[in-house]
């Protein structure tokens, strides 16, 4: 099941997903996708990075934190409705069945009032981030302006998810954590 | 010592079921993922399905998708691979294969002959 | 996926003598966070199940004999049999790891000329 978010028509969406590098600039590749994730890899690939950078992007979708940190939580800029399904978020931990693959479901509603779109670069405010802390906590919300509709059941789930999975095989090398988006 | 035990092949028809077990002994199945891979006659391995330790998450090949579920019985260390829909393409050995710390296959079954054929 | 692909498909070498097998993948298995290769080589000898020999591109599984050895980074790699022995006889196998569904190389035949 997906965390759900929300973002009008017009706005710009967030789609929160992290990931602890062992040390800045020891990244892991990412790829986003629009779609459920598939087995391996992202479907409909919109944005993906490598060891060192962003390699691959498309019109207005966008990293707006840092990336190096692992924040690579991914904003779509200025939302239709055609915008709205399930994007997967993957992060591409090397390994047999080694990555971590969160579905977010973005819902877009129409506008309320239609004023010219404005571009909004502090999103934090706007689009609260849902964190698991490593991955492993209880999910803590940041209530800052509306909250997304999140079922913290869900959250739960995708952190037992974490816990079931080959990462803490990789952290003797990598050093790689993750916090659901 | 790590040891694999596996069972279940056999003549099938086109379009008919079998289901593979691989007892594990000499380590605790749900410390680890583990595998299945098959090799056709004559032919070279190819990776069919995955799974995590406590069965959480499972991976298939995309030339066995919707037709072959990998599963597991922790409590009784065995691994197991259900296939349905079976075509005269999935004539093979199939291998069960302990996966170390999600890298590579460090410990193998002997193999199971399934052979498809009307 | 990645594509492992192997050279030669069949060798043959004199008792004693020195063999090597090439394989080469589509896109690099090097993870630079933790400088590894995430290449293993694997021996099948006939109607037995393959057996891991190599990992990390060069570290020997416990057991195997040292005239077996592992190099190469990136796209590349080698396996290299030191002094060929009848038991060596068999049928050697690449695999990545690093994405993907893991995958094998198409196998190289080590024969004894």
């Known amino acids: 099941s997906e965390v759900e978010y929300r973002a009008e028509v017009g706005q710009n969406a967030y789609l929160p997903c992290f990931y602890t590098p062992a040390a800045p600039g020891n990244l892991v590749p990412v790829c986003w996708g629009k779609g459920a994730c598939p087995v391996f890899e992202c479907g409909n690939v919109v944005l993906a990075t490598d060891e060192r950078d962003v390699n691959y992007w498309t019109s207005r979708y966008w990293l707006n934190g840092d990336f190096r940190k692992g924040d690579v939580s991914l904003t779509i800029e200025n939302v239709t409705l055609a915008d709205s399904g399930i994007y997967c978020c993957r992060i591409q931990i090397p390994g047999i069945m080694n990555d971590e693959k969160f579905n977010l479901k973005l819902v877009i509603k129409p506008a309320k009032v239609t004023p010219a779109p404005t571009r909004q670069r502090d999103f934090t405010a706007a689009f609260p981030r849902m964190l698991t802390t490593r991955g492993h906590g209880p999910a803590e919300t940041q209530t800052l302006g509306s909250l997304p509709d999140i079922n913290l059941t869900q959250i739960s789930t995708l952190a037992n998810e974490l816990r079931d999975s080959r990462l803490a095989n990789d952290l003797r090398d990598s050093g790689a954590t993750i916090r659901i988006g | 010592q790590v040891q694999l035990q596996q069972s279940g092949g056999g003549l099938v028809q086109p379009g008919g079921s079998l289901r593979l077990s691989c007892a594990a002994s000499g380590f605790t199945l749900s410390s680890y993922a583990m595998s299945w891979v098959r090799q056709a006659p004559g032919k070279g391995l190819e990776w069919v399905s995955g799974i995590s330790g406590s069965g959480g998450s499972t991976y298939n090949a995309d030339s066995v998708k919707g037709r072959f579920t990998i599963s597991r019985d922790n409590s009784k260390n065995t691994l197991f691979l259900q296939m349905n829909s079976l075509r005269a393409e999935d004539t093979a050995v199939y291998y069960c294969?302990?996966?170390?710390?999600?890298?590579?296959?460090?410990?193998w079954g002997q193999g199971t002959l399934v052979t498809v054929s009307s | 996926e990645i594509v492992m692909t192997q050279s030669p498909d069949s060798l043959a070498v004199s008792l004693g003598e020195r063999a090597t097998i090439n394989c080469k993948s589509s896109?690099?298995?090097?993870?630079?966070?933790?400088?590894?290769?995430?290449l293993a080589w694997y021996q099948q000898k006939p109607g037995q199940p393959p057996k891991l020999l190599i990992y990390?591109?060069?570290t020997r599984e416990s057991g195997v004999p040292n005239r077996f050895s592992g190099s190469g980074s990136g796209t590349d790699f080698t396996l290299t049999i030191s002094s060929l022995q009848a038991e060596d006889v068999a049928v050697y196998y690449c695999q990545q790891y690093y994405s993907g569904p893991p995958t094998f190389g198409q196998g190289t035949k080590v024969e004894i000329k």
């Open positions: 294969a302990k996966i170390f710390g999600s890298y590579y296959f460090d410990y």
């Open positions: 990390w591109t060069s």
């Open positions: 896109q690099s298995v090097l993870y630079s966070s933790n400088n590894k290769n995430y």
